[in-house]
């Protein structure tokens, strides 16, 4: 490990927010990746333990991929015997840090995503206020979640084939966690924000979606002004 001579110090996690999912339950035959992004000076080394013992490729059929540049452990086509606690140990001469992940391998039938009943819920908001729509997704397979807003094109809500016109407001990306995708936040709403919103969840089996409506009311001052204008 190289020592640059500046800011020498013990290892630390560079992306702790990416490490908060400590229990991973995945269907058999899927690929699993554990990451422990870290830094330190000198650059720390990373090693992996399974159930507290050194973990090497020959310990499992299909082997493992250790990507030191990405601080990751990859296991393809997981089987029930891969269940257990996986610990990354990151160390340099100034110290050592570790993180343990628990892997559960599921053998039940994967299904299309199940969305919690009643979510997202219809909302009524005052002009200029903030609104949150929630969507709770249950899926054996990794779901791909999108938030859509239904829009009109040339006065029509649907295309020639009957497909609704939608615009994607939020979708899975490199910097978006599953938790973040379960909430759609609208700030300082305008009358244009009123309409139908859809939470769409897909996996390798299929899609499921739930919709909700946002009604935007004028602010109270506007209501008062309207009343005064209408008085004799």
């Amino acid at each position: 490990a190289e020592d640059t001579g500046v800011d020498t110090g013990a290892p630390y996690w560079t992306r702790p927010e990416r490490m908060d999912k400590k229990l991973l339950a995945v269907p058999a035959a899927n690929t699993v990746r554990f990451r422990c992004p870290a830094a330190g000076n000198p650059t720390p080394s990373i090693s992996w333990l399974k159930n507290g013992r050194e973990f090497r490729g020959e310990h499992r059929i299909g082997g493992i991929k250790l990507r030191h540049q990405q601080w990751s452990l990859v296991m393809e086509s997981v089987v029930p015997s891969d269940r257990g606690n996986y610990t990354c140990v990151v160390e340099n001469k100034f110290g050592s840090i570790r993180q343990t992940y628990t892997l559960d391998v599921l053998e039940r039938s994967p299904h299309r995503p199940i969305l919690q009943a009643g979510l997202p819920a219809n909302q009524t908001a005052v002009l200029g206020s903030d609104v949150e729509f929630h969507c709770k997704v249950y899926s054996d397979a990794q779901p791909h979640i999108q938030w859509l807003k239904h829009v009109e094109v040339n006065g029509s809500k649907v295309g020639p084939d009957g497909t609704p016109y939608v615009t994607v407001l939020k979708t899975a990306g490199a910097n978006t966690t599953d938790k973040e995708l379960e909430v759609l936040s609208l700030h300082n709403v305008t009358f244009e924000d009123a309409g139908e919103y859809t939470c769409l969840a897909g996996n390798s089996i299929g899609f499921s979606h739930h919709s909700a409506w946002l009604v935007v009311l004028p602010a109270e001052e506007e209501l008062v002004e309207a009343d005064e204008a209408g008085s004799v």
């Epitope: 039938s109 299309r112 969305l115 919690q116 009943a117 990794q142 089996i205």
Partner: antibody, heavy 124, light 112 residues
């Protein structure tokens, strides 16, 4: 035109291996899950396996689990099925089928486009 | 696994007459999003299956309106209002809720 074209079928002895391929065209292959379905001569349809759009999720029928491996190469618009330890009962026409895509489903969310199939015969 | 049971095994129909095929699932196919994920296919001799009906009752593009799907939860029906000679083939129902995806055993439709 949306098309799926299977290849790689043939006659093979029990215990041997075979690799099937499916070339996709006319749609954004990398946005769709893909399936294999088979049909034994004179019999009904049996689902074999599925792979997610990015290859990270794979599921198999119990009858092929541990013997067959589904994979994909999105850069080449190709789906594959590696079949090992073949048995006489694996004899069938193997169809490549388009699964669920990304985005708001326009009509059915998959299982709408089937290839013509490729015949696999396992016989001693 | 969800078992799909199809009846009858075969059907001989006079052209212009209606035909009905039943399919029963061992579990409800009504999903949390309110849709019922049963699909219907026809397979003509030497060809791959062709999609007719998706999500219980939606006709796939290009499918004649003499084909219709109905039912609820575990009992489903495919109806052909007036059978034509070109409708000959084997008809299959399929559940698209969970893996393994499963098909009915098929119903062979012939013309009298």
């Amino acid at each position: 035109e949306v098309q799926l074209l299977e290849s790689g079928g043939g006659v093979v002895q029990p215990g041997r291996s075979l690799r099937l391929s499916c070339a996709a065209s006319g749609f954004t292959f990398s946005s769709y899950a893909m399936h294999w379905v088979r049909q034994a001569p004179g019999k009904g349809l049996e689902w074999v396996a599925v792979i997610s759009y990015d290859g990270s999720n794979k599921y198999y029928a119990d009858s092929v689990k541990g013997r067959f491996t589904i994979s994909r190469d999105n850069s080449k618009n190709t789906l594959s099925l590696q079949m090992n330890s073949l048995r006489v009962e694996d004899t069938a026409i193997y169809y490549c089928v388009r699964g669920a895509g990304h985005g708001f489903p326009t009509g059915p969310d998959g299982f709408d486009i089937w290839g013509q199939g490729t015949m696999v015969t396992v016989s001693s | 696994d969800i078992v799909m049971t199809q009846t009858p095994l075969s059907l001989s129909v006079t052209p212009g007459q209606p035909a009905s095929i039943s399919c029963r699932s061992s579990r409800s196919l009504l999903h949390s999003d309110g849709k019922t994920y049963v699909y219907w296919y026809v397979q003509k001799s030497g060809q791959p299956p062709q999609l007719l009906i998706y999500e219980l009752s939606n006709r796939f593009s290009g499918v004649p309106d003499r084909f219709s799907g109905s039912g609820s939860r575990t009992d489903f029906t495919l109806k052909i209002s007036r059978v034509e000679a070109e409708d000959v083939g084997v008809y299959y129902c399929m559940q698209y809720v969970e893996a393994p995806l499963t098909f009915g055993g098929g119903t062979k439709v012939e013309i009298k």
